[in-house]
């Protein structure tokens, strides 16, 4: 679609004479009628195929015309046409006298034509006007004429629809040959897509509207390049969403059971050496001088019993010191001045002489050792509580103080993470190597399933014919809103069919 | 015995959509997910995405990001996979396998479904 | 996305031989994150090794698993009759995770 234009400048006809060479009366009164058509090799009468055009009067003899002529008439004349422009045409510009007002083919004389002139030739669509004269025996016409595009159409035969839109359709303006020129911010053929933030991630990103940056379910940070972890996951990662890559030292579903309880808690104290035992488990080895779970107590160091065949220990500022009973001698009164004759032995261990009599040793019931017999046999020097349990003297036996988490005689079990009901709401409790786990009854989620969740009664789709459906989040049940032509509590009755009930 | 069981062959048209189901038995069902693999002939195996049975959280593959559903029942234990707008290229054997979200392989396998897509 | 390649497309070899099988990514990828499964004909795949290097439960250990980065290696050190099959790695630490498109262990 698009326009030819042509600008009449100047008709002369000095003499104001007519064609026939009769002169006007009083004068010429001329206006002009225009015929644009297809190009012909010899311009002949015939339909104006790509329109016509006439003028009111715009002078008298010889005048000049003004651009937008007053009168009602426009310069330039303007001839549309909404077909592909073929580049090229003819052209036929009659000038007429107008006797009176009545401009129509029929009411003017066939005499009352001034002059004609027929032109033909190849004119391409553009900006630039062509300048033309046409001279015959009486008049002279100076005119320019030239073809450009109608709104919103392009290229070089204005064949190219393009209108300039800023909305959910698209987002660009046109360049000269009718290609798109997409504004700042989009993008693709039509430029519908928004360019995202600058580094957004391809896949795991998108956007609705230019410099913006929204994450698929899974991931998150300003770019979308950092995935979520599984929900729960408490010393893990993950390098694509939901999962739950534990730590060094954490183990379990969520990674949430310390593997090292050493490094992560440093449990033992003054300088103690400490070992993983298990989970959440660990040993202290006590650097001497020191006792305890932990080697949180400062021994005396009288508490070791350095003194033998029952000699009383002192503890001193730089050490201790042994008082020995009758009969011995020594740092730790371990040399004896006694024989067996002066019935050294206790508890009724049997005395048996050694090197002729100068010396003697003790045989000592059970229960008893030192080398008088003097000292209760200490059941906890062979370290029988497991898993850091404390061995405890109690007269004839001795017993483990277990630490949270263990029993049994020996500290040798753990107590069942179940046993102590944790899961809420009739969740089915499991032991698991690394802890426990609650499998929650439909309508309650969590680690212990305290967290109440609606159920979702939409999940087995009750609706019929494409009925959407919608929880009512109170109650737990479901309501189908029905397309149109359905009703009945789950559309599933045609309207115009009424339900065949049994009765 | 750690045990996947899939729904049985179906046959479609172009555009229509399929569910195929997969039931789990053998192990504790929330504490795992299930991921959805094909195989056809032309493309391999192609993970299709996974699904939490502990929380419902998925993850699908982006190519079928737009006509894909997974859902879990953790009552029946059983897992379900719906692919809409259904094409003739998506005729293939589809599986579901188990997954964890800290362990990263798919072990053990259903048997398979085969889907064909035909006019 | 990541692509896995594996080489050669088909092995053919007798049994009692060694069989190397070879898997590489396009870009690199965490070892904890690789497997490796066996396909029989009819069949549905079954995970052989995990952790690039680590063989899953029941599976017989003239299977090795090794390689990190980008070159992962799947080795049969003695075929036996029931090894004939076709062979898959997988890599799941990027989104998709992608298989390769397999290896066919044929008798010679």
């Known amino acids: 679609s698009g326009v030819f234009q042509l600008q009449l400048q100047e008709f002369i006809n000095e003499r104001g004479v007519l064609a026939s060479g009769r002169p006007c009366e009083p004068g010429c009164r001329t206006f002009f009628r225009v015929c644009l058509k297809h190009f012909q090799a010899v311009v002949s009468p015939g339909p104006c195929t790509f329109g016509t055009v006439s003028t009111p009067v715009l002078g008298t003899n010889s005048f000049a015309v003004r651009d937008d002529s007053s009168g009602g008439g426009r310069n330039p004349l303007q001839l549309p046409f909404n077909f592909t422009w073929p580049g090229t045409f003819s052209l036929i510009i009659e000038a007429w006298h107008a006797p009176g007002d009545d401009l129509r083919p029929e009411a003017l004389p066939p005499d009352a034509l001034i002059s004609k002139i027929a032109i033909q030739g190849s004119l391409a669509v553009g900006q630039n006007w062509l300048l033309d004269e046409q001279t015959s025996t009486l008049t002279r016409l100076r005119y320019s004429y030239r073809v450009i595009c109608s709104d919103n159409y392009y290229g070089d035969n204005c064949s190219r629809l393009c209108k300039k839109r800023n909305d959910h359709f698209g987002h660009y303006v046109c360049q000269p040959d009718g290609n798109l020129s997409c504004l700042p911010g989009w993008t693709g053929e039509y430029c519908q897509q928004p360019i995202c933030l600058s580094g957004c991630h391809e896949q795991n990103g998108y956007c609705s509207k230019p410099a913006e940056c929204l994450c698929r379910p899974g991931w998150q940070g300003r770019l979308c390049n950092e995935c979520i972890p599984h929900n729960g996951c408490r010393h893990g990662t993950c390098s694509t969403p939901w999962q739950c890559t534990c730590d060094e030292g954490w183990g379990g579903l969520f990674c949430d059971q310390d593997l090292n309880y050493c490094t992560h808690h440093s449990p033992c104290k003054n300088g103690a050496t400490c070992s993983n035992s298990g989970q959440r488990s660990y040993t202290c080895t006590c650097r001497p001088g020191y006792t305890g779970v932990d080697c949180e107590l400062e021994l005396s160091e009288c508490d070791s019993n350095p003194c033998r065949n029952g000699g009383s220990c002192k503890d001193q500022e730089d050490g201790y010191h042994c008082l020995c009973p009758p009969g011995y001698y020594g740092l730790h009164c371990e040399h004896s001045t006694l024989s067996c004759a002066d019935s050294p032995c206790f508890n009724g261990g049997s005395c048996r002489e050694r090197n002729q009599g100068a010396n003697y040793a003790c045989e000592c019931p059970p229960n008893f050792t030192g080398s008088n017999c003097e000292k209760k046999v200490d059941r906890c020097t062979s370290n029988p509580c497991a898993n850091g349990g404390q061995c405890l003297n109690r007269g004839p036996s001795r017993m483990c103080r277990c630490r949270p988490g263990f029993t049994g005689t020996y500290c040798e079990l753990h107590v069942s993470d179940c046993a102590r009901n944790p899961c809420a709401h009739g969740g089915t409790c499991h032991d698991l190597e690394n802890g426990l786990m609650c499998t929650c009854p439909a309508g309650f989620s969590g680690r212990r399933c305290e967290v109440r969740t609606s159920i979702d009664a939409c999940a087995s789709s009750p609706c019929f014919n494409r009925a959407t459906c919608y929880t009512d989040l109170s109650t737990d049940t479901f309501v189908c809103n029905c397309p149109y032509g359905f009703v009945g509590s789950r559309c599933e009755f045609p309207v115009g069919l009424p339900p065949s009930f049994p009765w | 015995e750690v045990q996947l069981v899939q729904s049985g062959p179906e046959v479609k048209k172009p555009g229509a959509s399929v569910k195929v189901s997969c039931k789990a038995s053998?192990?504790?069902?929330?504490?795992?997910?299930i991921s959805w693999i094909r195989q056809t002939p032309g493309q391999g195996l192609e993970w299709m995405g996974w699904?939490?049975?502990?929380?419902?959280?998925?993850d699908y593959a982006q190519k079928f990001q737009d006509r894909i559903t997974m859902t879990t029942d953790t009552s029946s234990t059983t897992a379900y996979m719906e692919l809409r707008s259904l094409r003739s290229d998506d005729t293939a054997v589809y599986y579901c396998?188990?997954?964890?979200?800290?362990?990263?392989?798919?072990?053990?396998w259903g048997q398979g479904t085969m889907v064909t897509v035909s006019s | 996305e990541i692509v896995m390649t594996q080489s050669p497309g088909t092995l053919s070899l007798s049994p009692g031989d060694r069989a190397t099988l070879s898997c590489r990514a396009s870009?690199?990828?965490?070892?904890?994150?690789l497997a490796w499964y066996q396909q029989k004909p009819g069949q549905a795949p079954r995970l052989l090794i995990y952790?690039?290097?680590n063989r899953a439960t029941g599976i017989p250990d003239r299977f090795t698993g090794s390689g990190s980065g980008t070159d992962f290696t799947l080795t049969i050190s003695r075929l036996e009759p029931e090894d004939f099959a076709v062979y898959f790695c997988?890599?799941?630490?990027?989104?998709?995770?992608?298989f390769g498109q397999g290896t066919k262990v044929e008798i010679k």
């Open positions: 396998a188990r997954y964890s979200w800290n362990k990263h392989w798919f072990d053990p």
């Open positions: 053998g192990y504790t069902f929330t504490y795992y997910g």
């Open positions: 699904i939490s049975a502990y929380d419902g959280n998925t």
């Open positions: 870009q690199s990828v965490t070892g904890s994150y």
């Open positions: 952790g690039a290097s």
């Open positions: 997988q890599q799941s630490a990027f989104s998709p995770w992608t």
